[in-house]
Structure formats: C-alpha cells, structure tokens
Interface confidence: low
Amino acid sequence: DASGDLLNTEAHSAPAQRWSMQVPAEVNAEAGDAAVLPCTFTHPHRHYDGPLTAIWRSGEPYAGPQVFRCTAAPGSELCQTALSLHGRFRLLGNPRRNDLSLRVERLALADSGRYFCRVEFTGDAHDRYESRHGVRLRVTAAAPRIVNISVLPGPAHAFRALCTAEGEPPPALAWSGPAPGNSSAALQGQGHGYQVTAELPALTRDGRYTCTAANSLGRAEASVYLFRFHGAPGTST
C-alpha cells in the first residue's frame, strides 16, 4: 500500500525516499487472541527528529474513527499513548524507526474490518501520510452464544420453538425437553455469518425446553418454558 494523503509539496533535493506505506492485505486471528497489524513506512525527511504522531483508525481511511493514537516528543523514541480504544491497542513498532505496527489484544468478532495506519510529522517538516487501502483484520472462532430463544404459534394450534446461536465454527444446536426420551428432533437451518438457527417444530407437552449450542470452543444453553392456558403460550427464558 504505497498510496496516501501527501500534504507536503515542498521540493526536496534528491530525496532518498518517497512517502510510502507497507501493510499486508490481510491479518487473520482467532477471537480472544491478540493480533499484530504490521505497518512500516518510508518518508523523504532524511533526518526528521521532530514531534510525530502515530494513528490507527478503523473502517475507512482519513475519516474512520481512531482506535489508537500516540505522540512522540522531539528526539524521543517513546510514543506516549493518547488513545487506546478499550485499552486493547498498543504500539509494537517504533515510529522513529519507521514502524507503526499495532497489537490488538483479546479480539472480538466485532473487531473484524479494515484498519489504517497514519503518521504525522508536526514539527518544521509539517507532513503526514496515511495508508489508503489498509489492512483487513479477519477475526474467526468464538465459543457459542445463544442470541435468541422463543416459542411461536405453529400450525393446528400447536407451538414451535426457535433457537438462534452464534459462534465460529458455527455451533451445532440440539433441543431437549419434556418429550419422551427427554430429547426432541430439531430442524437445523443454515444461518448467516456466525449464526445458526434450530427449530423444534411441534411442542407437544408443557414444560421446559432447552437449546444447547456447542462447538470446539465451548457450549451454551438457554431454556424456554411452555405453559398453555386460555389458548396462549407463556414463555420464560
């Protein structure tokens, strides 16, 4: 990624370098782990030792929200953190050595997306540069979480139960309940993204119905209670 927003139009005599930024196209990591977003750069200011700011933002270049920002004083190799979203972002690289690499701790699925590094020289050589294409962070794998469980009216005055869970790898869902054998056949539908849904098509008895979601990282369960009176379901989770 060697494109960016170049503010400085001042002519430099035989510059050793042009502005450029090097980031990988993609970084993959598991939810709950840490990930490193590499970013290195070159610049035309041969011996710049003035104040600088390193910035990472998410979503889109130039306008996306900042997730990390640090500032180094003139001559200092210590970049003092001014912003670290939720305390989970920290600079691994040394901006004085042209390295803005960022570590993100304890990834959540919601951290997936594009991240853009930016450096600002704020001294005499007033200049700034930002990666335009950024690095795509893909967060995979999460223990199951049941996001919705409900009882709905079904055909012929019966009731059906729906259970939606998310996880990566997608969890297997199973229903159990007061039916004979304490287990009921479930129709497992294909979900979208990290979510899967299982339907228990006919709730034949009153009582507690439990949905269990399991994958290689763990399991989760939730229950609904069916009590039929006056022709209406009462449910509780």
């Epitope: 939810a31 709950g32 782990d33 939720h86 305390g87 989970r88 701790e105 304890r106 959540a108 699925l109 919601a110 999460a142 223990a143 199951p144 979480r145 998310e166 996880g167 990566e168 990290y194 290689s216 990282l217 763990g218 399991r219 989760a220």
Partner: antibody, heavy 121, light 104 residues
Framework: DVQLQESGPGLVKFSQSLSLTCSVT?????????WNWIRQFPGNKLEWMGY???????NYNPSLKNRISITRDTSKNQFFLKLNSVITEDTATYYC??????????????WGTGTTVTVSS | QIVLTQSPAIMSASLGEEITLICSAS?????MHWYQQKSGTSPKLLIY???NLASGVPSRFSGSGSGTFYSLTISSVEAEDAADYYC???????FGGGTQLEIK
C-alpha cells in the same frame, strides 16, 4: 459439573518462586475455554493474572509479564502458575478460574475454592 | 487501562428493600459482568454481559447499563444477599473495587 481445585505451598519466601497447581475435573482443558489465574489481595482487590487457552497459548497481565508463567499438563488435566521473584505484595488468595469467551466478551463462570499464599521475609 | 469505580463502597439495606449498586468505567465499555462473593468463599458469577442472569441466580437480581455507567439491582433484599459485589469488564481485564452489602 466442572470443578477446579488449587493446591500449593501456603508460605513462600521473599524473592523465591511461587508455584501453584489447578486440578480440573469434569471438563478437559484441551476441549475449550480459557483457564485463568486470578488473585485477591488482603482488602479484597481482585487482579487477573493470566490464562492458558485450550490450545496451549497464553496471555498475561502486562503488569506481571516479566515474572509470570502459566503452563499445563494435559495428561493430568492440570494447569500451573509460576510467579518468580515474589515480594510481600504478592501475598494473596489465588484462584484458578474458567473463563468463557463468547465472541463479544469474556467472563469467569467457574471458580476454584482458592488457596492463600503468604510471602514471608 | 480502564478503571472501574464502584459505589457505594459499603451499603446497608433492610430486608425487602430494593437497592442499586453502581459501577462506572473510566471509558466506554461494551459489557459489564458482576460477581458475588460471600464471606469465606470464592467469587461467583452473578450477571454476565450486563443483564443476563447466571445459572441458578434468583430473579430478584438484575443488571443494566451501557457506555460508562452500569448498575446491579436487587429488587427485594434477602438475608442471604449479604456479600461483596464486584463488577468486571473484559477488554482490559479489570475489576471494580467492590461494594460490601450489609443487611440491617
């Protein structure tokens, strides 16, 4: 039901290493979840120390990173805490704790009974 | 590092009273978890992801909040609720200092 039980010496000398064992029953530590050490100081302040994941990878509290090591013995379904160069401020009750991570957050759902460690000078 | 501040540090309540414990974060967090610790025992998960009751927790407990402000409410205090209560946020591994609940 999963159960966790800490064991180890109750008294450790200043500057030596603290070593504790967590024995897990009812669930294989290689099957999932995060297996943590958390300590509670006199006065009841809680501090997360670190974890070992089901795949053997680690993460530690940055304030302890140079002194802490968490390892495991999968054949015995145990994981271990080693804290080097202990000081009197390491006197605390140490808990081993299971953490569930659900993709959006993590929380500690099963706690051991705790073991009290005193650092003596 | 996100700092969690719990208030009050000590609360005294009468049987049947409704009480609310507060946990404020130094910057915005997505979720808060709550633990109960009775004297001489280990902490126990009470509420996870802000408002979900852990298994076996009585329905008189509830949690709410968002951003930097979270709360735990006990709708009708019982004698067995005497304990220390801790909030916990996951993203930078921190716990609040705790609220000690005494029953009058």
């Amino acid at each position: 039901d999963v159960q966790l039980q800490e064991s180890g010496p109750g008294l450790v000398k200043f500057s030596q290493s603290l070593s504790l064992t967590c024995s897990v029953t009812g669930y294989s530590i290689t099957s999932g979840y995060y297996w943590n050490w958390i300590r509670q100081f006199p006065g009841n302040k809680l501090e997360w120390m670190g974890y070992i994941r089901h795949d053997g990878s680690n993460n530690y509290n940055p304030s302890l990173k140079n002194r802490i090591s968490i390892t495991r013995d999968t054949s015995k379904n145990q994981f271990f805490l080693k804290l080097n160069s202990v000081i009197t401020e390491d006197t605390a009750t140490y808990y081993c704790v299971r953490e569930i991570y659900d993709g959006s957050s993590g929380y500690f759902d099963v706690w051991g009974t705790g073991t009290t460690v005193t650092v003596s000078s | 590092q996100i700092v969690l501040t719990q208030s009050p540090a000590i609360m005294s309540a009468s049987l049947g009273e409704e009480i609310t414990l507060i946990c404020s974060a130094s910057s915005s967090v997505s979720y808060m978890h709550w633990y109960q610790q009775k004297s001489g025992t280990s902490p126990k998960l009470l509420i996870y992801r802000t408002s979900n009751l852990a298994s076996g927790v009585p329905s008189r407990f509830s949690g709410s909040g968002s951003g930097t402000f979270y709360s735990l409410t006990i709708s009708s205090v019982e004698a067995e609720d005497a304990a220390d209560y801790y909030c916990h946020q996951w993203s930078s591994w921190t716990f609040g200092g705790g609220t000690q609940l005494e029953i009058k």
